[in-house]
Interface confidence: low
């Protein structure tokens, strides 16, 4: 549950009180500092005389509830907690076309961690207009593109000028392709390999498969310079090796220089493309291995080893790299690329005009529609500190509550705000403050987190020669006496010289004088038992660690152990406090407990005979929900099947909706229509009755593979 705490800067910071029942329990430890470092649930009672005579001072270290239950006043509890202070929190704002925008808030916070205790805070991100763009221009340099090359040389500046209308951060790069350098794709006559163009006088480069020429850069002059150095080449057959080039451009992210921003790949050609299988014509049988194979000069060196990739491979690589391809092609090949567009997600096709101005417009349109991803990243953490993110995206793809080592939201639109909940946790103390930086990949703004750890008790300075410690025989700190040399006992009341006196030992034995001193669970000091560990009582006869355990945890973590008996917290019961009094897990979607076919015990349904399932909602011999609703799903969605004639009557209590939900996990029913067409549906219980979400199956595609 989230509380709001007013920080020292006067602003509100959200934080989460840690669930103290997690991860083991608090063990007795003999000093306040060691106590608070031993487990995040540990507190220390500094009240004078809190421990009974002879009881180990280590028993001052316990869980807060236990200490309170044992009579420690709240104000005497030493329980430092982690905290947060917001140091700078400029409100999110658009700025002017991304210029001067505040996209990340807060900008600076101070987080103090208590080892073992998580601290959770919210980071907000506003996608301002002006999201960065990486654009890689991939050009067919076969001889037929000679005239286009001249136009493309002028394109760099135009691209930046237009793209800077919508973004303040642009990177453009350039690559080129021809085809595999083996017959029948290119001529292998030596003179033709060296100079494949028709005229000996024109500038022409030897054929190549793919050449990455210019890594993504913000420098239009570099684009123009590098493109200006290019010459056309030549090949024999009509289709080109563009798929090899696209795949390498998608896979070789480091070499291309792709950032984690909107990624566009502009593919220009005047012809079609070779695809998987065509390599066999040139004696290449090994399928494309889906790996980057660029040498230090940016040349695809393995083109004669691997076949062309399939359409599926190209689509998968582009999708995985979050690259949106824009096919800018001449009129004759347009229909082929329009078909290709259907098979590649988030792709666009346009006809290449004489002056290439529509390529720029195509890019503008594609950029506008591109769904962007916001990824919250962090700088290196100091040893012993961990971080996790929950992303609250408020879009079609919510990732509510899923923790990961980076925050991510997909399909974040301009003006949309997304939230990330960041959890920091330390396992031990930091030797010094650490500055942690959080930023959304591709954006300049950062959240600076000043990381500190709290590792000391705040009991104040030790009181030397305290009267409490037998009139000055020791120093008092955090409620316990540190005895002067030669003095012993809880209150330093005993001299070492008195230790061996047999008379004193009688106070450490049972009245009958038999059995070991202090029940064998402590030391006899000054005629009193000083118990060790979890033992207590005048003779250490009571063991506060011998209670029943649930799942290996003493009193299930929901109570405290006192002399072998669990004293459970208010909402738990049972000999090991293993039983929750809550019934949340027993409530059926329709309301009611255990679907009316069982009773709730320890927050778990105990089903009556013949019923089973977590909510007793399934029965032996009954139809499964899939069987039960298959015919209603078919007739409601497609108007076919055995109930087609009287669907509205038989399925009156069922609401059927069509969906294009992308994930078909285990909850989906997989059935076939009367004409053997595969379809999927999901049975949901709503207040209004049963809802069937039906996904029609595309012909020839099996989503279960």
């Amino acid at each position: 549950e989230l509380d709001t705490k007013i920080t020292s800067s006067g602003e509100a910071a959200e934080w989460e009180d840690p669930d103290l029942s997690l991860q083991g329990s608090c063990q007795p430890v003999p000093s306040c500092q060691k106590c608070i470092l031993s487990h995040p649930s540990c507190a220390w009672c500094k009240q004078l005389n809190f421990t009974a005579s002879g009881e180990a001072e280590a028993r001052r270290c316990a869980r807060r509830e236990e200490l309170l239950a044992r009579g420690c006043p709240a104000q005497e509890l030493e329980e430092p907690r982690g905290r947060q202070e917001v140091l700078q929190d400029k409100p999110l704002s658009q700025g002017d076309r991304g210029e001067g925008a505040t996209q990340l808030a807060p900008q600076r916070i101070r987080v103090t961690l208590r080892p073992g205790e998580p601290q959770k805070f919210r980071v907000r991100f506003l996608r301002a207009a002006g999201y960065p763009v990486d654009l890689y221009y991939l050009m067919d340099l076969s001889y037929s593109m000679k005239d286009d090359l001249e136009r493309v040389r002028q394109l760099g500046h135009a691209l930046l000028v237009r793209l800077q209308e919508v973004t303040h951060s642009v990177r453009i790069g350039f690559g080129s392709f021809v085809d595999k350098t083996v017959l029948p794709f290119v001529s292998t006559v030596p003179s033709k390999l060296h100079h494949p163009c028709p005229s000996r006088l024109e500038r022409c480069q030897p054929p190549f498969s793919f050449h990455h020429v210019l890594s993504l850069t913000g420098d239009a002059q570099a684009f123009e310079r590098e493109v200006g150095r290019q010459n056309v080449s030549g090949n024999l057959d009509s289709p080109e090796g563009g798929f090899d080039a696209i795949l390498q451009a998608a896979l070789c992210q480091e070499q291309i220089g792709w950032r984690n921003v909107s990624r566009l790949l502009v593919f220009t050609s005047d012809d079609t493309f070779h695809t998987a299988g065509d390599g066999k014509l040139g004696g290449i049988f090994m399928p494309s291995d889906g790996r980057c194979h660029l040498d230090s000069n940016g040349v695809y060196t393995n083109s004669a080893e691997f076949d062309y990739p399939s359409v599926g491979q190209v689509a998968q690589a582009l999708t995985a790299a979050n690259i949106q391809p824009i096919f800018a092609v001449t009129g004759a090949t347009l229909p082929v690329y329009q078909e290709l567009r259907q098979l590649i997600p988030k792709s666009a096709v346009g006809e290449l005009s004489e002056d290439s101005s529509n390529v720029v417009q195509l890019i503008m349109d594609a950029y506008d529609s591109l769904s962007s991803t916001v990824t919250l990243e962090h700088s290196p953490l100091p040893p012993g500190v961990s971080i996790s993110f929950e992303s609250h995206c408020k879009g079609p793809e919510k990732t509510e509550g899923e923790a990961g080592d980076r925050g991510q939201c997909n399909d974040v639109r301009v003006n949309q705000t997304v939230d990330f909940w960041v959890t920091l946790q330390a396992t031990h103390c930091l030797p010094e403050a650490h500055v942690l930086r959080l930023w959304a990949l591709g954006f300049s703004e950062e959240l600076t987190v000043e990381l500190h750890t709290v590792c000391d008790c705040n009991c104040g300075d030790a009181q030397p020669h305290a009267p409490y410690c037998s009139d000055g025989q020791g120093d008092l700190q955090c409620g316990i006496c540190s005895c002067a040399p030669g003095r012993l006992g809880q209150l330093c009341e005993c001299s070492e010289a008195d230790l061996s006196s047999p008379d004193l030992e009688s106070g450490c034995r049972a009245p009958n004088g038999t059995g070991p001193l202090c029940s064998g669970k402590g030391r006899c000091q000054c005629g009193r038992c000083s118990c060790s560990g979890q033992s207590s009582g005048r003779l250490c006869e009571c063991d506060d660690a011998s209670c029943e355990r649930h799942e290996g945890i003493l009193c299930g973590g929901f109570g405290h152990c006192q002399c072998g008996v669990c004293h459970c917290h208010a909402n738990h019961t049972g000999r090991a406090c293993e039983c929750s009094k809550s019934v949340d897990s027993c409530v059926s979607p329709e309301g009611g407990l255990c679907s009316g076919h069982g009773y709730c015990k320890c927050n778990r349904c105990q089903c009556l005979d013949g019923y089973y399932g977590a909510l007793c909602d399934q029965c032996l011999g009954c139809k499964s929900p899939c069987e039960q609703y298959r015919d209603c799903a078919e007739c409601g969605a497609f108007g076919t099947g055995p109930l087609a004639a009287n669907c509205s009557v038989v399925c009156a209590d069922v609401n059927v909706t069509l969906t294009l939900a992308p994930n078909l996990d285990d909850g989906w029913c997989k059935e076939r229509t009367i004409d053997n067409q595969l379809f999927f549906f999901l049975v949901e219980h709503a207040a209004s009755g049963i809802v069937l979400r039906v996904r029609p199956q595309e012909k020839g595609v099996d989503h279960t593979r």
């Epitope: 700025g95 991304g98 210029e99 001067g100 925008a101 930046l160 800077q164 303040h168 951060s169 642009v170 990177r171 913000g218 420098d219 239009a220 002059q221 570099a222 700088s379 290196p380 010094e432 403050a433 650490h434 500055v435 930086r437 930023w439 300049s444 703004e445 950062e446």
Partner: antibody, heavy 117, light 107 residues
């Protein structure tokens, strides 16, 4: 190749404002961070501040009340203004390309500014 | 501010020898430590970034090491053209701060 060139008056009177321009070629200042550094006669170097590609600024706290860094993206220039100068501000002023990791990979040749009456 | 301390202030060298320059930060700067070379009447030139990463175009005789608070710039086989002032600079926290420099001179 990224090139930077500082320009501005070489002599400024005490209590007046020092204004310098950095002209950048080969790179849009709407990418990266662009900073000012100065080197005093005793060879001591001081980071003065930067303007980021989004236009946000960060200044050295020792100068915060006197410094302003602005830019003109249309001219691909960014500017330094330092108010109320004293003879202690006599130094060679450099503009440089930088980033959030703090290093300066491209520098201008520097311009010497003397504060004297 | 993070105070950067360089030592020695001046180092007399013989061409061909291997030398090490030291830079110490008053608090941890992780590996956000960069080295520059500045020759007379020239602007500084980046030699090493992130404590140990080499820069394209910088001779391989220059190398860097260290993290946290202690860093070293090594020159394996000093050449006459290396006689300059060398600065370290931290970029871990603002304000970025420089060391006072180590001047390399001929023995």
């Amino acid at each position: 190749e990224v090139q930077l060139q500082e320009s501005g008056p070489g002599l400024v009177k005490p209590s007046q404002s020092l204004s310098l321009t950095c002209s950048v070629t080969g790179f849009f200042i709407t990418n990266n961070y662009w900073g000012w550094i100065r080197k005093f006669p005793g060879n001591k170097m001081e980071w003065m501040g930067y303007i980021s590609y989004s236009g946000s600024t960060s200044y050295n706290p020792s100068l915060k009340s006197r410094i302003s860094i602005t830019r003109d993206t249309s001219k691909n220039q960014f500017f330094l203004q330092l108010n109320s100068v004293t003879t202690e501000d006599t130094a060679t002023y450099y503009c440089a390309m930088t980033g959030s990791s703090g290093y300066f990979d491209f520098w201008g040749p520097g311009t010497m500014v003397t504060v004297s009456s | 501010d993070v105070v950067m301390t360089q030592s020695p202030a001046t180092l007399s060298v013989t061409p061909g020898e291997r030398i090490s320059l030291s830079c110490r930060a008053s608090e941890s700067v992780d590996t956000y430590l960069h080295w520059y070379q500045q020759k007379p009447n020239e602007s500084p030139r980046l030699l090493i970034k992130y404590a140990s990463q080499s820069i394209s175009g910088i001779p391989s005789r220059f190398s860097g090491s260290g993290s946290g608070t202690d860093f070293t710039l090594s020159i394996n086989g000093v050449e006459l053209e290396d006689l300059s002032i060398y600065y370290c600079q931290q970029g871990n926290s603002l304000p970025n701060t420089f060391g006072a420099g180590t001047k390399l001179e001929l023995k």
